[in-house]
Amino acid sequence: KLLQVSTIAMQQQEKLIQQERALLNFTEWKRSCALQMKYCQAFMQNSLSSAHNSSPCPNNWIQNRESCYYVSEIWSIWHTSQENCLKEGSTLLQIESKEEMDFITGSLRKIKGSYDYWVGLSQDGHSGRWLWQDGSSPSPGLLPAERSQSANQVCGYVKSNSLLSSNCSTWKYFICEKYALRSSV
């Protein structure tokens, strides 16, 4: 009789452990759901606030007409700068006009002062032609002022209100550019 009672007690205890385990799993599952819900709500809020503000440029980017610009706070070589911009869904700055050049140099003066900033301009090793990264040629007024004496690949950068050239492997700040979002109003 005593053996029977102890067997039942052990079975009950086993059941209790299983229930506790199930409860723990359920609590964990509930916590996971709550966390997912939080992310989902955050995403929804972000989307809604973006829709309300319809901000054409991301935070910390500067807008001018149809473009958004990001001025880096780190130095890197030209190729790494390009990679950094691509990760943001942008490319190194491509200056299309004198007006855009003036805006950029004016903004840089306000933000940082007279530093070097890589732009998306590089010199073809064979022909010596300057080309933007999309393969187009810069307008005559937007060619680097001095030819770099480097035997290595040569890339373009902005300093003060000039476009200059340097060995692509030197370290500089950089400027990314992407299209501004059009407001759908």
Partner: nanobody
Framework: QVQLQESGGGLVQPGGSLRLSCAAS????????MGWYRQAPGKQRELVAA???????VYADSVKGRFTISRDSAKNTVYLQMNSLKSEDTAVYYC???????????????WGQGTQVTVSS
């Protein structure tokens, strides 16, 4: 996780053409840019061409005027049309996506397995 499937590599004569395709699949929140990189034996992997989600395009100096990158956003596919191929273009070509897997994750590089392009007579 983002999966990238390349196709279109092969053996071609100098001056010939090839078209590479890369389809992105899997679960991801957004893709900021897709592109092609290549690695020749004994050399570092280098960017060939890339296209951002906004449609901006980047080419390596060595391929400007010969290669054209394009995309089909609806299919999450990127293409590389390679014309006037040279022996220097011989390499393994890798598809790349700069993507965020979720709303809270940072943008990371995802890579395909690579497809061999050999330019030889």
């Amino acid at each position: 996780q983002v999966q990238l499937q390349e196709s279109g590599g092969g053996l071609v004569q100098p001056g010939g053409s090839l078209r590479l395709s890369c389809a992105a699949s899997g679960r991801f929140f957004r893709v900021n840019a897709m592109g092609w990189y290549r690695q020749a034996p004994g050399k570092q992997r280098e960017l060939v061409a890339a296209i951002t989600n906004g449609g901006q395009i980047v080419y390596a100096d060595s391929v400007k005027g010969r290669f054209t990158i394009s995309r089909d956003s609806a299919k999450n596919t990127v293409y590389l049309q390679m014309n006037s191929l040279k022996s220097e273009d011989t390499a393994v070509y890798y598809c790349n996506a700069k993507a965020a897997a979720s709303y809270v994750s940072t943008v990371a590089d995802y890579w395909g397995q690579g497809t061999q392009v050999t330019v030889s007579s």
